[in-house]
Interface confidence: low
C-alpha cells in the first residue's frame, strides 16, 4: 500500500492532459502580506479573497486591502475593491459570512482614531456592498444570530453590547461593561457583565445575563461568574465557590432557569476548565491539574451534564498557549484522538473509539519501522502530530484531517515509536476511523479531501518553490503527480470548499513571475479525472468499528452498529456534490459497558461493575439537582449518553436514596455549602477560544 506509484500502482491514462485542460491560474495584481479566503454559501461557487497589507506606525496601523470575488470556485477572480470604496478592512476580523445560505457578508473597516467604525454589508453573496456607519468601534467580529441572519450582535472596544435587527443599518446599545457575549438557542443572548467594575479585574464577580427579546428585558441568571460557555444543549458557568479563589462548574439545560453543580473538581486561580467537545448528548470536559504541569484530566458527562466519569489522565493541555491535541475524528462516530504527557515527559497519542470510555495507543502501521524513541523495535505505536506540535514549530504543516462524508478516512502527520518524535514526520492514513494505519506519504505534506473521499490531494511541504501536486483516487494507496505550472510558486496553502464535496482544489502562493511576489492561485478541477458518476456497483458494504467478525456483537459502539456503503478503492468515479452517506444502523444488546457509573459510584480497575465510592459512605452527596430540595436516588448506573442499546444486561440493584437539602441557586451562591473534591486547572487567560481549534469553551 501507499507506494507513490509503486509496482502495484498503474497511473490513470491521460491524467496530465485532463488536468491541464482544467487548471485555471489567476495572478493577483497584489503584493499584500496576507490573504483571507471565505466561501459564501454552500455550492454557490462564490469565494471572497481579502488581501491585506499593513504597517504599524507609532500607535496606529495603516494599510490597504483589496477584495476579489470568484463565482466559479476560484477559477477566476474579479477585483471588486471598488465595492468597498478601497477601504482598509481589518484582517483580524476576517470576512464574516452569514449562517446557512443567507448570502450575507460583513467586512469591518479600520477607521483609525475615530469614535465609530464602518462596516460593508452584502446580502447577495458579495455581488454588491453597502456601507453602514457604526456608533461604536467593534472589539471583535460581529456575530450573526444563527437563526436570523438580519440580527447582529457586537461588542465594542468600550465593552458595550450592541444589537442590530436590520442587518447593520440601525444599532441600539443593550448593555454596558459586557465582558463576553454569545448567541444561544432561538435568538437568546447570554452575556457576562460587571455592574460595578471592569472586565479586566474582578473576573469572578460577573453577572450572567440573558435576554430572549433582543434586549427589551434582561434576566440575571447567575452571579459570581468567572466565565461561561455553551456546548450542545448545555450552558456552563464557572462560579466562585465562596471559598476564596476556588471556582466550580455549574450547568444548566434550560438556558439558565435552573442550575446544577457539576460533579467535577473545583479549580484554583491558576487553573482552568475547557470544554473539548459537546453535543446535545454529552460533553468532554478538561480540568487542569494544579501547578504549571501542562496537563489535566478529561471527564465525560452524563446526559444531564452533571455526573462526570474520569476518562483520561495526564491529558496534554498547555497553560501557556492553550494548546491541546484533542481531535474529534468526524469520519467515524465515537472516535477521538488526543495526547497525553507521560511520566517521563514524552508525549504520546491516545485514541478512543467509544466516546471516551476507553483510551488506547494507536496501532503501529504495518509498513513502518519503530523509530529511535522505541525501547523495543518490534513493539511501538503511531503518534500523531496535532496542534501542540504545530505550536512547537515542528515540521508539521497540518493538523489531522477527517470529514463526516468521507467515512473512515483520517489523515495525519505522525511518527512511529514510543512517543512523538521531533524528527521530520511522515503522513499516515487510516481508512477505518483510526483502528489501522498506513504510511501514505514520505515527509510532511499539505493534504485535503475532495469529492467525499473520492480524491485525496497533497502538496509537499517545502521551503523551495513548488509546482507539483499529488493526488490519489484510492484513499491514499497509490499516488500520481501533476505539474500544474512550469513556474514554481512559493506555496502558502491549499483551499477547497468546506465540506469536502467539491472537486476543485485551489493552490495559493506567490510568484515572482511578472513582478516580485504576487499572489497567485491555481484552481484544478478533477471532474475529468473522475469521468463518470458512481453507480451501485462502485460501492461496497463496510461494518464500522469491526474488530472481530466472528463476534455477534462485532461493531457495537454505544449500543448500536452501523454498516456503510463505501466507495471501492478501485472505483474511479464521482460521488458528486449531492452524495449522502448511506448507513444502516442496527441496535445491540446492552452490556455493563453501555452504562456509566452514577454519582457516588466508580469502576474498579478491570471490572465492569459499578461499586459505591468508599469515601462517600456516610457522607451526604454534595450535589444538588434542579436547584431545589431533591431526593437523589440512584442504582449506581446510568446509560451512556447517546447509547441506543436495548435488552441484554439491565443492571438492576437496590435503589439508594441519597438525601441532601441544598440550594444550588446561583442568585445567592453564598448559600452553597460545596466542599471541593480535588482540584484541576489552567491559564485563566481572558481568551475565549469558543471556536478556535474546535475547542468549545476555554475559560
Amino acid at each position: 500500500r501507499s507506494t507513490e506509484q509503486g509496482e502495484s500502482c498503474s497511473g490513470l491514462l491521460g491524467a496530465d492532459a485532463k488536468l491541464a485542460g482544467n487548471t485555471h491560474q489567476h495572478i493577483f495584481n497584489d503584493l499584500s502580506g496576507s490573504v483571507s479566503l471565505a466561501w459564501v454559501g454552500d455550492g454557490t461557487g462564490v469565494i471572497l479573497a481579502l488581501t491585506t497589507f499593513q504597517v504599524p506606525i507609532f500607535m496606529i496601523t495603516i494599510g490597504q486591502s483589496k477584495l476579489y470575488r470568484s463565482e466559479d470556485y476560484g477559477k477566476s477572480f474579479e477585483d471588486v475593491t471598488n465595492l468597498i470604496n478601497n477601504t482598509f478592512i481589518r484582517s483580524d476580523f476576517g470576512i464574516a459570512i452569514g449562517p446557512e445560505n443567507s448570502g450575507k457578508v460583513i467586512l469591518t473597516a479600520d477607521v483609525s482614531g475615530s469614535h465609530g467604525s464602518r462596516i460593508f454589508v452584502s446580502s447577495d453573496f458579495g455581488k454588491s456592498f453597502t456601507h453602514q456607519e457604526l456608533p461604536f468601534v467593534p472589539l471583535m467580529q460581529i456575530t450573526y444570530n444563527p437563526e436570523n441572519s438580519n440580527v447582529l450582535l457586537a461588542l465594542s472596544n468600550k465593552n458595550e453590547l450592541w444589537l442590530s435587527e436590520d442587518f447593520g443599518t440601525n444599532w441600539k446599545k443593550l448593555y454596558d461593561t459586557v465582558c463576553l457575549a454569545k448567541w444561544g438557542r432561538k435568538g437568546t443572548i447570554f452575556f457576562t457583565a460587571n455592574h460595578n467594575g471592569s472586565c479586566s479585574n474582578d473576573r469572578g464577580m460577573l453577572e450572567l445575563e440573558r435576554t430572549t427579546d433582543y434586549g427589551k428585558s434582561f434576566k440575571t441568571v447567575a452571579s459570581k461568574i468567572y466565565s461561561f460557555g455553551l456546548g450542545g444543549k448545555f450552558l456552563f458557568a464557572s462560579v466562585m465557590t465562596g471559598k476564596g479563589t476556588l471556582r466550580a462548574i455549574h450547568v444548566s439545560v434550560d438556558d439558565g432557569d435552573t442550575w446544577n453543580m457539576a460533579q467535577l473538581p473545583s479549580v484554583g486561580q491558576e487553573q482552568f476548565y475547557s470544554i473539548l467537545a459537546a453535543n446535545d448528548d454529552m460533553v468532554f470536559m478538561h480540568v487542569d491539574e494544579p501547578g504549571d504541569t501542562g496537563f489535566g484530566t478529561i471527564f465525560t458527562s452524563d446526559d444531564r451534564g452533571i455526573v462526570y466519569s474520569k476518562s483520561l489522565d495526564r491529558h496534554l493541555y498547555t497553560t501557556t498557549g492553550g494548546e491541546t491535541d484533542f481531535t474529534n475524528v468526524t469520519s467515524l462516530r465515537g472516535v477521538y484522538i488526543t495526547s497525553v504527557l507521560s511520566e517521563d515527559n514524552s508525549i504520546q497519542t491516545m485514541i478512543t473509539f467509544d466516546q471516551g470510555g476507553r483510551w488506547t495507543h494507536l496501532r503501529k502501521p504495518e509498513n513502518s519501522e519503530c523509530d529511535a524513541t522505541a525501547k523495543n523495535k518490534n513493539e511501538c505505536s503511531l503518534h500523531i502530530h496535532a496542534s501542540y506540535s504545530i505550536s512547537q514549530k515542528l515540521n508539521v504543516p497540518m493538523a489531522p484531517l477527517s470529514e463526516p462524508n468521507a467515512v473512515g478516512i483520517v489523515i495525519a502527520h505522525g511518527s512511529v515509536g514510543d512517543a512523538i518524535s521531533v524528527m521530520v514526520p511522515d503522513v499516515y492514513i487510516s481508512d477505518d476511523g483510526g483502528y489501522s494505519w498506513t504510511k501514505m506519504l514520505e515527509g510532511p505534506h499539505y493534504y485535503t479531501i475532495l469529492d467525499s473521499g473520492g480524491i485525496i490531494v497533497a502538496i509537499e511541504h517545502s521551503s523551495r518553490p513548488i509546482n507539483v501536486i499529488k493526488f490519489s483516487t484510492d484513499e491514499g494507496q497509490c499516488w500520481q503527480t501533476y505539474t500544474f505550472t512550469r513556474d514554481p510558486i512559493y506555496f502558502t496553502g491549499l483551499a477547497s470548499e468546506p465540506g469536502a464535496r467539491s472537486m476543485n482544489i485551489s493552490i495559493w502562493g506567490f510568484t515572482e513571475s511578472f513582478l516580485t511576489s504576487q499572489w497567485v492561485s491555481y484552481t484544478i478541477d478533477f471532474k475529468d479525472i473522475l469521468e463518470r458518476n458512481c453507480e451501485e456497483k462502485d460501492y461496497t458494504i463496510w461494518l464500522a468499528h469491526s474488530t472481530d467478525p466472528e463476534d455477534y456483537e462485532d461493531g457495537c459502539i454505544l449500543g448500536y452498529k452501523e454498516q456503510f456503503l463505501r466507495l471501492r478503492k478501485s472505483s474511479v468515479c464521482q460521488n458528486g456534490r449531492d452524495y449522502v452517506v448511506t448507513k444502516q444502523p442496527s441496535i445491540c444488546l446492552c452490556s455493563l459497558e453501555d452504562f456509566l457509573c452514577d454519582f457516588g459510584y466508580y469502576r474498579p480497575e478491570n471490572d465492569s461493575k459499578c461499586v459505591e465510592q468508599p469515601e462517600l459512605k456516610g457522607h451526604d452527596l454534595e450535589f444538588c439537582l434542579y436547584g431545589r430540595e431533591e431526593h437523589l436516588t440512584t442504582n449506581g448506573y446510568r446509560k451512556i449518553p447517546g447509547d441506543k442499546c436495548q435488552g441484554g444486561v439491565n443492571p438492576v440493584r437496590e435503589v439508594k436514596d441519597l438525601k441532601k437539602k441544598c440550594t444550588s441557586n446561583f442568585l445567592s451562591p453564598e448559600k452553597q455549602n460545596s466542599k471541593s473534591n480535588g482540584s484541576a486547572g489552567g491559564s485563566g487567560g481572558l481568551n475565549d477560544i469558543f471556536e478556535a481549534q474546535k475547542i468549545e469553551w476555554h475559560e
Epitope: 491560474q25 495572478i27 493577483f28 495584481n29 497584489d30 503584493l31 497589507f53 490597504q64 483589496k66 477585483d79 509546482n467 505550472t485 512550469r486 513556474d487 514554481p488 510568484t511 515572482e512 513571475s513 511578472f514 513582478l515 516580485t516 511576489s517 504576487q518
Partner: antibody, heavy 118, light 111 residues
Framework: EVQLVESGGDLVKPGGSLKLSCAAS????????MSWVRQTPDKRLEWVAI????????HYPDSVKGRFTISRDNAKNTLYLQMSSLKSEDTAMYYC???????????WGQGTSVTVSS | QAVVTQESALTTSPGETVTLTCRSS?????????ANWVQEKPDHLFTGLIG???NRAPGVPARFSGSLIGDKAALTITGAQTEDEAIYFC??????????FGGGTKLTVLG
C-alpha cells in the same frame, strides 16, 4: 554588470515576419518576468509583451495579440519575440526590458530597430 | 484602457530640486501600480531608475527618488545636474492591461 542585448531587427514588408532575440547577463534571468517594449517614431513607449519567469504565462496588449509571440530559453538566458503579420504601425525601436515590482528595479537593452514598409 | 499622463516638459537649474509626476486616468496611483521610472538619453539609451514606486536601481545616484504624492506617482531629483537632462517615462502596472507608459517628460536643466 546587468546587460540586455537585442538583435534581429530589420526592414520587412507588411505581412512579413521577424524574430527578435535578447541575450541577458549579469542577473538570474530565470527568476524574473521579462517584457518587450517598443518606442514608436513619435517617441511614445508601448509595452508589447510580457512573459513569466518560467515561461508559463504570456500576455499581450490587444494591438499585437495573435500576431506576436514572446518566449524564453532560460538555459540560454535568452528572450525572444516572434512577430508575424507585421503592419506599418509596428515600425519602432524594440527594447527588451525587465520592468519591476517592489523588490527589484528595471533594466533595459539598447534596442533593435524594426521597420515595416513596402 | 488606462491612460497615464505626465508633464510634457519641465525646466530646472543645476542644484535645484525638481519633481516629475505621473497620473492615472483610473484614479489614485497606489503602491499596487508599482510605478517604474525610466530615463531616455539621446541615441535610444534607456536606463531604469526606479522600480516598485520607490526602489532605486543599483548604480542610480541617490539624488533620484520615487514616491507617491497625493494621488500621483512622483520622481524627485534633489539637486539636479546637467547630465540629468533627458526624457523621463513612467510606467504603471494594471492588473487588466499590465504596463502602461506615460507620454514622457522632457526635462531641461539650464546650465
Amino acid at each position: 554588470e546587468v546587460q540586455l542585448v537585442e538583435s534581429g531587427g530589420d526592414l520587412v514588408k507588411p505581412g512579413g515576419s521577424l524574430k527578435l532575440s535578447c541575450a541577458a547577463s549579469g542577473f538570474t534571468f530565470s527568476s524574473y518576468g521579462m517584457s518587450w517594449v517598443r518606442q514608436t517614431p513619435d517617441k511614445r513607449l508601448e509595452w508589447v509583451a510580457i512573459i513569466s519567469s518560467g515561461g508559463s504565462y504570456t500576455h499581450y496588449p490587444d494591438s499585437v495579440k495573435g500576431r506576436f509571440t514572446i518566449s524564453r530559453d532560460n538555459a540560454k538566458n535568452t528572450l525572444y519575440l516572434q512577430m508575424s503579420s507585421l503592419k506599418s504601425e509596428d515600425t519602432a525601436m524594440y527594447y527588451c526590458a525587465r520592468l519591476c515590482g517592489p523588490l527589484c528595479s528595471g533594466y533595459w537593452g539598447q534596442g533593435t530597430s524594426v521597420t515595416v514598409s513596402s | 484602457q488606462a491612460v497615464v499622463t505626465q508633464e510634457s516638459a519641465l525646466t530646472t537649474s543645476p542644484g535645484e530640486t525638481v519633481t516629475l509626476t505621473c497620473r492615472s486616468s483610473t484614479g489614485a496611483v497606489t503602491t499596487s501600480n508599482y510605478a517604474n521610472w525610466v530615463q531616455e538619453k539621446p541615441d535610444h539609451l534607456f536606463t531604469g531608475l526606479i522600480g516598485g514606486t520607490n526602489n532605486r536601481a543599483p548604480g542610480v545616484p541617490a539624488r533620484f527618488s520615487g514616491s507617491l504624492i497625493g494621488d500621483k506617482a512622483a520622481l524627485t531629483i534633489t539637486g539636479a545636474q546637467t547630465e540629468d537632462e533627458a526624457i523621463y517615462f513612467c510606467a504603471l502596472w494594471y492588473s487588466n492591461h499590465f504596463w502602461v507608459f506615460g507620454g514622457g517628460t522632457k526635462l531641461t536643466v539650464l546650465g
